[in-house]
Each structure stands twice: as structure tokens, then as C-alpha cells.
């Protein structure tokens, strides 16, 4: 089952999947002036490889492209990388059966990757450079099914401007000693949910992240 909504935003942080679960979809998006081949609308993680390779061809008319496919129109876009420079995946890729690695870039690829995650997917959070990580628990969010709905758990990470770190020493000590209560996995509350409420915005892009870098 596809996850509704995006992984939660953590101010001044970025998230990344170390590997992608079977069924994950990546839109074939092309940069301005290029369009995807009609038959290559998206890539899907099948087993531990991607079903096809995205391709972009020159588009002299520069027609506006649909952001999502008809099959996925009802799903919210889930973007995990940047609007101006894709962060490079480094070292930590898991190689598990039923999981795919980060697909290699394709020629004329859009700077923003739009993923559609599936239940059970986890994403790892890190503070963007310039921000110090204050961690109270795992900096991970997992898409879980609860009471018939998918939602993301809240990562235990706060990012503070490193240039102001002297102002945060007291709060860092108190946050470090605080234990975050584990989520209730069994009960289904009538009016509330363990999942953070989805926001109107999609997952944080690096444009936003970097604009916020020293704010």
C-alpha cells in the first residue's frame, strides 16, 4: 500500500531513504526543455532492481509536464531531494532482498525527485550543514499502517544553528536526558493519532532547507 502524505518535516533537516522497498515508485521527471518518453512514466522497485530506466528527450516546445501520472493522481507527491543540487548518496546504501538502491541519475533529469513510498518504508533524517543535531531518539520516520490508514512516525531530531550553539547548551542537556515515550502500537484513539498531522506542503526540498539554513 502506498503511503499517503509525506514524511514529516523537521526544520533545518533533510531526509533520505537508505534503500527503497518493493513497490516504491519514482516519477520520471525531466528538467525544463526536456520531456519523458511516453512509455516511461515512472520507475518501480521490483525485487531489488528498478523496473525501467527513465529517459528524457529534447522538447523544443517546452510543454508543461504533468507532475504525476494518471494512475497516481490521487496520491500526494513525495519528494526527497533538492531543487538546486541533488545531495549525493554516500556509503550507507543497504543491499537487501526486496529493496532497491538509489537509482542512478539519468540524462536531463529534473533536480527534484518525486518518490511514492510504500508501507514499511523508513527514511533517515540529518541536520543540514550549519545546523547541530540534538537527538532524543532515532532520527528515523517509518510509514506504518494504523487503524486502516498509513502515516509516518515522528523522528526524534531537533536541528539548531551551530553558530548559536552556546545558547542551546542548557536545552541540549535537558533534551538529552528526556526519554520520548514509545508510540502506542495497539490502541486506536477515537479522535487523535500517533502520526503527526500532514502539512499542506510536500516534503522539504533543499531550496527550502538551504533558505532556512542559517535562520
Amino acid at each position: 500500500e502506498l503511503c499517503l502524505y509525506d514524511p514529516p518535516e523537521v526544520p533545518n533537516a533533510t531526509f533520505k531513504a537508505l534503500s527503497y522497498k518493493n513497490g516504491t515508485i519514482l516519477n520520471c521527471e525531466c528538467k525544463r526543455g526536456f520531456r519523458r518518453l511516453k512509455e516511461l512514466v515512472y520507475m518501480r522497485c521490483l525485487g531489488n532492481s528498478w523496473s525501467s530506466n527513465c529517459q528524457c528527450t529534447s522538447n523544443s516546445h517546452d510543454k508543461s509536464r504533468k507532475q504525476v501520472t494518471a494512475q497516481l493522481e490521487h496520491q500526494k507527491e513525495q519528494q526527497t531531494t533538492t531543487d538546486m543540487q541533488k545531495p549525493t548518496q554516500s556509503m550507507h546504501q543497504e543491499n537487501l532482498t526486496g529493496h532497491c538502491r538509489e537509482p542512478p541519475p539519468w540524462k536531463h533529469e529534473d533536480s527534484k525527485r518525486i518518490y511514492h513510498f510504500v508501507e514499511g518504508q523508513s527514511v533517515h533524517y540529518e541536520c543540514i550543514p550549519g545546523y547541530k543535531a540534538l537527538q532524543r531518539g532515532p532520527a528515523i520516520s517509518i510509514c506504518k499502517m494504523k487503524c486502516g490508514k498509513t502515516g509516518w512516525t515522528q523522528p526524534q531530531l531537533t536541528c539548531v544553528d551551530e553558530r548559536e550553539h552556546h545558547r542551546f547548551l542548557a536545552s541540549e542537556e535537558s533534551q538529552g536526558s528526556r526519554n520520548s515515550s514509545p508510540e502506542s502500537e495497539t490502541s486506536c484513539p477515537i479522535t487523535t493519532t500517533d502520526f503527526p498531522q500532514p502539512t499542506e506542503t510536500t516534503a522539504m526540498t533543499e531550496t527550502f532547507v538551504l533558505t532556512m539554513e542559517y535562520k
Epitope: 538546486m84 545531495p87 554516500s90 550549519g130 551551530e162 531550496t207
Partner: antibody
């Protein structure tokens, strides 16, 4: 006291490789993003690369993309810059800094010349 | 890439002077500009971050202002130990870019 100590610089021929290290102490290394900045002789400062606190995301200037690799070993409190296919224009003093540039090392000189 | 145009390139000043230098970004960078001091033979030091915030331990004679594309750095009551090259840097988007520097020299 925060300390960043670079090492690994030296004279290298064009096309060859060099790996710089930056040993960090006096702060919780794994909580901080890190960066490399270089300065060619008598020139200004030029950002080279940055890495997030856990090493998942890396960022590079275009002229070094595909040739340089920034990485880190949080267990050893060390930042690295692997430099391949070096060019004469890479000649510079390379500084290691925290991601917000509040702390800098003393720099290590890399000279690329035949 | 965002180009940071710094002016002037150099200035001849006297102790006690008020020194002002400027940085102009080629596009809007909000308040994401920092100022650094680099003395001969030393590594750079952060003085001002986010356009106007003085970093810990930096004397209050150093001030910064501006937002959007135009930024100003001022040294009030210039001291001999302030002789250095000063750089602005935009931290709004990658690639991070520095100005070319302003060198302060004694008259």
C-alpha cells in the same frame, strides 16, 4: 576547546590522487555537518564540499563533482576529502570547517604540478 | 550560481576610522550572508552570521546589515589588529559562494 587539524597535503602530479584528513576534537563531531573550503595562493576563498552530520548527504561545487569525494568517520571523529584526477587549478590551501563555518582548521597545502 | 560582488577591493585606513564595505548578491539571498576575517597566514574567522548577528566573542565594533541582495559590513573605531582581508559569503543556496574580499591596509 574545538580543534580541527588537517593533514595529507603535499606535492602531486596532475591526474594523480590525494586524500586529505581532518581530525576533530573538543566537540561532538557526529552532531555537526562539516565542509571543505580552499584558497589558491594569493586568491580568495572557495567552497569545495559539505556533508551532513551522519554522512548521508554530500554537496559539491561543479568543478570538483565526480573528482572529489567528501566523507566522514564519526567513530574516528575524522573528515576526509578524496581528491582524484587532480588539476593544476586545484592547487590551494584546503581548510576543514564545521558546516556553519564557525570553526576552521589551520589548512593543508595541496600543490598540483608536474 | 549566486555571484557575490564585494567592494571595494582594498581600503587604506587609519586607526580610529569607521570602515564600511559592501557585498551585492546576484539574486535574493534573504539574510543568509556571513562575514569572515582572515589575517595574513591565518585561517578565516567568522564575525557576522545571518547578515547582522555577531558571533560569540566578536567585539561590538563589528556590525553587519542588509537583506535581499545588498549587504554592508562596518568596523567602528578601526583598531590595528583589524588589519585583514574581509570576505562575505552567501549561505542561501548551493554552491556556497564568497565575495572576492576587501583588504584593509594602513594609510
Amino acid at each position: 576547546e574545538v580543534q580541527l587539524v588537517e593533514s595529507g597535503g603535499g606535492l602531486v602530479q596532475p591526474g594523480r590522487s590525494l586524500k586529505l584528513s581532518c581530525a576533530a576534537s573538543g566537540f561532538t563531531f557526529s552532531d555537526y555537518g562539516m565542509a571543505w573550503v580552499r584558497q589558491a595562493p594569493t586568491k580568495g576563498l572557495e567552497w569545495v564540499a559539505s556533508i551532513t552530520n551522519g554522512g548521508l548527504n554530500t554537496y559539491y561545487r561543479d568543478s570538483v563533482k565526480g573528482r572529489f569525494t567528501i566523507s566522514r568517520d564519526n567513530a574516528k571523529c575524522t573528515l576526509y576529502l578524496q581528491m582524484d584526477s587532480l588539476r593544476s587549478e586545484d592547487t590551494a590551501t584546503y581548510y576543514c570547517a564545521t558546516g556553519g563555518f564557525s570553526f576552521w582548521g589551520q589548512g593543508t597545502l595541496v600543490t598540483v604540478s608536474s | 550560481d549566486i555571484v557575490m560582488t564585494q567592494s571595494p577591493t582594498s581600503m587604506s585606513i587609519s586607526v580610529g576610522d569607521r570602515v564600511t564595505m559592501n557585498c551585492k548578491a546576484s539574486q535574493n539571498v534573504d539574510s543568509n550572508v556571513d562575514w569572515y576575517q582572515q589575517k595574513t597566514g591565518q585561517s578565516p574567522k567568522l564575525l557576522i552570521y545571518k547578515a547582522s548577528n555577531r558571533y560569540t566573542g566578536v567585539p561590538d565594533r563589528f556590525t553587519g546589515s542588509g537583506s535581499g541582495t545588498d549587504f554592508t559590513f562596518t568596523i567602528r573605531n578601526m583598531q590595528a589588529e583589524d588589519l585583514a582581508v574581509y570576505y562575505c559569503m552567501q549561505s542561501n543556496s548551493y554552491p556556497l559562494t564568497f565575495g572576492s574580499g576587501t583588504k584593509l591596509e594602513i594609510k
